[in-house]
Interface confidence: low
């Protein structure tokens, strides 16, 4: 049969907590031994763990409210898939019975004494009441018992005396005009009213009491505008921390216009709310290192070979750079200090060449001297050999690019009687004078 499955079993109360859902079998619910289940009709909550005795229930109330009785408590075999011990099935109850006594004795009723004498009349004039009393001590009740009926009775009495008339206040008169024009100043403005003891006046014979309380009443005036309050500076606050960890910084002190706060049109505080000071950490600031330019590439060589120049044999070359300027624990330069690449050496190799196109015209030289000229060139450019542009290195490192290195000796057919460089020169026209721009401002 499907059951309700819960995620917790509360040992102390025996209740299922955290409903997971219904319509599942006990077997599926109890795949997790921390879970618990309950029949759909609101039956007993059973934990999914192996069966064991529950905690003892609280003791039931004593069977009698006075003198000796007895009381029961129980525990239950709860769990799933088994029993608590031999011959003790799931759901079995085990009982304990003990003697109990809520109250040692049972109450017994007492009896009344005779009525006492009548007390004096409750008033000294006109009509009132008088009372008499009796005691519950013939015999006295036992163990919290009582006597039936009332312990006192009352009846009317007449003093045959005329009562005096006591004074009573007439209605309050109107409020007087206000004693000031704004509130919150040194003297709080107020209004006053008075009343007379005449409704009625106290009798002379027999003498009546005067009216109780004051004949005058004062109250604060309402609806007045507040008195203006001029602002006053509070004390300077603490100096803020130095905002820098090295070199010079600037700290600040603040004060607030709150002693008192300006109110109701009163003037604000004069002067500054802040003041600043220089703070000196006396610590030099760190300077990070910076890479210098790369040095020249070293000669292209191959280990264990005297020279690979003009050969289709890849070699290696390296260049270095230095980390400059690091001071006071600044950051070191990031990156590599050494750069390595693969190369073919064409140093001083005789190579077939071809003439380049004309270069663009160069700058006018000398820029500030007499008769400046500009030049352009055609160069005998070497035709590089068709060696493989990449080489395979150690297993797993893939292909590496190979660079030609060195100054070859290109061979071109003679051009205008030249073998390496043909140059053409022209004069520069309309040349302005060189002047210091700062002097020109004057």
């Amino acid at each position: 049969d499907p059951v309700l499955c819960f995620t917790q079993y509360e040992e102390s109360s025996g209740k299922c907590k955290g409903l997971l859902g219904g319509g599942v079998s006990v077997k599926d619910c109890c795949l997790n031994t921390a879970y618990a289940y309950q029949e759909r009709n609101g039956g007993l909550c059973q934990p999914c763990r192996s069966p064991r005795w529950s905690l003892w229930s609280t003791w039931a109330p004593c069977s009698v409210t006075c003198s000796e009785g007895s009381q029961l408590r129980y525990r239950r075999c709860v769990g799933w898939n088994g029993q608590c011990s031999e011959r003790v099935a799931l759901g079995t109850l085990e009982w304990q019975l003990q003697a109990c006594e809520d109250k040692q004795c049972c109450p017994e009723m007492g009896g009344w004494s005779d009525w006492g004498p009548w007390e004096p009349c409750s008033v000294t004039c006109s009509k009132g009441m008088r009372t008499r009393r009796r005691a519950c001590d013939h015999p006295a009740p036992k163990c919290g018992g009582h006597c039936p009926g009332e312990a006192q009775e009352s009846e009317a009495c007449d003093t045959q005396q005329v009562c005096p008339t006591h004074g009573a206040w007439a209605a309050w008169g109107p409020w007087s005009p206000c004693s000031g024009s704004c509130h919150g100043g040194p003297h709080e403005p107020k209004e006053t009213r008075s009343r007379t003891c005449s409704a009625p006046e106290p009798s002379q014979k027999p003498p009546g009491k005067p009216c109780p309380g004051p004949a005058y009443e004062h109250r604060k005036c309402t609806g007045l505008p507040p008195c203006p309050v001029a602002g006053g500076w509070g004390p300077w606050g603490p100096v803020s921390p130095c905002p820098v960890t090295c070199g010079l910084g600037q700290t600040i002190e603040r004060r607030t216009c709150n002693r008192p706060v300006p109110q109701h049109g009163g003037p604000s505080c004069a002067g500054d709310a802040t003041r600043t000071h220089i703070c000196n950490t006396a610590v030099p600031c760190p300077v990070d290192g910076e890479w210098d330019l790369w040095g020249q590439w070293s000669t292209c060589v191959r280990r264990n070979m005297k020279s690979i120049s003009c050969e289709e044999i890849p070699g290696q070359q390296s260049r270095w750079r230095t980390c400059k300027g690091r001071k006071f624990d600044g950051h070191r330069c990031t990156g590599q200090q050494q750069d390595i690449r693969h190369c073919y050496s064409i140093q001083h190799c005789p190579l077939k060449g071809s003439w380049s196109e004309w270069s663009t015209w160069g700058l006018c030289m000398p820029p500030c001297g007499p008769n400046p000229t500009r030049a352009r060139q055609r160069l005998c450019t070497p035709l590089l050999p068709k060696y493989p542009p990449t080489v395979s290195m150690v297993e797993g490192q893939g292909e590496k690019n190979v660079t030609f290195w060195g100054r070859p000796l290109p061979r071109c057919e003679e051009l205008q009687g030249q073998k390496l460089v043909v140059e053409e020169k022209r004069p520069c026209l309309h040349v302005p004078a060189c002047k210091d721009p700062e002097e020109e401002k004057l």
């Epitope: 803020s240 921390p241 130095c242 905002p243 820098v244 960890t245 910084g249 600037q250 600040i252 500054d272 709310a273 802040t274 003041r275 600043t276």
Partner: nanobody
Framework: EVQLVESGGGLVQAGGSLRLSCAAS????????MAWYRQAPGKQRELVAE???????VYADSVKGRFTISRDDAKNTVTLQMNSLKPEDTAVYYC?????????????WGQGTQVTVSS
């Protein structure tokens, strides 16, 4: 001029958390200190927490260990993370920036954000 805009206020149960944020715009290069102040009804405005340009912090005794102030210079924001909130933390919270000029400082304030902590 510096403009400050607060956000993140609201109603929270005692023991809960809120994160207030203050975005600064305008002439922010000369701001050195940023701070959070608060003002409860009928009381004076009081300092809650302050942070300098290099991250030095100052906290009011009543919030030490519960509130954390931080700044993100890339976004020009200052944040107040408020944990274990108490009913007495109920107030309007104001962002404050202190700008240093050559001849002294200038105070700038946001419009305030309401924080209400219910018991």
């Amino acid at each position: 001029e510096v403009q400050l805009v607060e956000s993140g206020g609201g109603l929270v149960q005692a023991g809960g958390s809120l994160r207030l944020s203050c975005a600064a715009s305008g002439r922010i290069s000369s701001i050195i200190h940023m701070a959070w102040y608060r003002q409860a009804p009928g009381k004076q405005r009081e300092l809650v927490a302050e942070i300098s340009r290099v991250g030095t912090t100052v906290y009011a005794d009543s919030v030490k260990g519960r509130f954390t102030i931080s700044r993100d210079d890339a976004k020009n924001t200052v944040t107040l993370q408020m944990n274990s909130l108490k009913p007495e933390d109920t107030a309007v919270y104001y962002c404050n920036a202190l700008q240093y000029e050559k001849h002294g400082g200038a105070d700038y304030w946001g419009q305030g954000t309401q924080v209400t902590v219910s018991s």
